[in-house]
Interface confidence: medium
């Protein structure tokens, strides 16, 4: 069965200064490749977290993404402000050469 990206929460309400937990799970380990989180979809979407690389000081992962069989890609975003409002998408990439290719979005 083809991998599905599941974001179970339709909305998350968070007070300013608090931490938001954005839940995301994958239904399969295949295809191999990283997860990335974006705010917004389509052109101009903003990268929030990249499992593979980058520096995202406000973001922590809920589980240990380095574990081989991990399928929980939930994240926490700290110190929420009104500017963080928006729709967040958990996106699975398929490992590719030279670059990973977008595979499926929550």
């Amino acid at each position: 069965e083809e991998l599905q990206v599941i974001q179970p929460d339709k909305s998350v309400l968070v007070a300013a200064g608090e931490t938001a937990t954005l839940r995301c799970t994958a239904t399969s380990l295949i295809p191999v490749g990283p997860i990335q989180w974006f705010r917004g979809a389509g052109p101009g979407r903003e990268l929030i977290y990249n499992q593979k690389e980058g520096h995202f000081p406000r973001v922590t992962t809920v589980s240990d993404l380095t574990k081989r069989n991990n399928m929980d890609f939930s994240i926490r975003i700290g110190n929420i402000t009104p500017a963080d409002a928006g729709t967040y998408y958990c996106v699975k990439f398929r490992k590719g050469s030279p670059d990973d290719v977008e595979f499926k979005s929550g």
Epitope: E46, H55, E102
Partner: antibody, heavy 122, light 107 residues
Framework: QVQLVQSGAEVKKPGSSVKVSCKAS????????ISWVRQAPGQGLEWMGS????????NYAQKFQGRVTITADESTSTAYMELSSLRSEDTAVYYC???????????????WGKGTTVTVSS | EIVLTQSPGTLSLSPGERATLSCRAS???????LAWYQQKPGQAPRLLIY???SRATGIPDRFSGSGSGTDFTLTISRLEPEDFAVYYC????????FGGGTKVEIK
Amino acid sequence: QVQLVQSGAEVKKPGSSVKVSCKASGGTFSSYAISWVRQAPGQGLEWMGSIIPIFGTANYAQKFQGRVTITADESTSTAYMELSSLRSEDTAVYYCARGGYAAGTDYYMGVWGKGTTVTVSS
Amino acid sequence: EIVLTQSPGTLSLSPGERATLSCRASQSVSSSYLAWYQQKPGQAPRLLIYGASSRATGIPDRFSGSGSGTDFTLTISRLEPEDFAVYYCQQYYSSYTFGGGTKVEIK
């Protein structure tokens, strides 16, 4: 061949708003991204925001959040960019550009309008 | 925000010479999401390269793009008179940002 035709030049007072239109012809409108980019005199290119008409919602550059509104009318294949609370620094050429297909991620700007000059002066 | 830094600011060359323009990103950008544009005075930008190395429709093969990660290059193998213009790189991986531009002028 897709063409983007923009509305004419505008002269506006500080504090007012401007609405620029961009009409697409010769191709599918609804499923392709339309972006707005501005260029102040002698300066570089600055992205303001984008919309895919079939989705209806726009993404905006943080700098313009709350001051710019991008909309699209599928019935007339026209996109609009409205910028409010104008100041002299908003004097620029405003371009619309068509990007990639909604189902993909090729959001480079392949087709551009000729630009609309907006002058903000008291 | 991903910042793109282009160098040099100005490149003075003669027709027939090779032009090498650099674009450096403040953080890694998938090469699938990098484009190059050409702009002449009084005109709208024109797409040259997308996906770091794919030529847009109608773009002559003297234009080529390369690079990955944080370092990207636009090469014009032999400058023609119509190639003297300003060139911008752009990333569309996280939001959109443009580099400051490189002006290619006649020496």
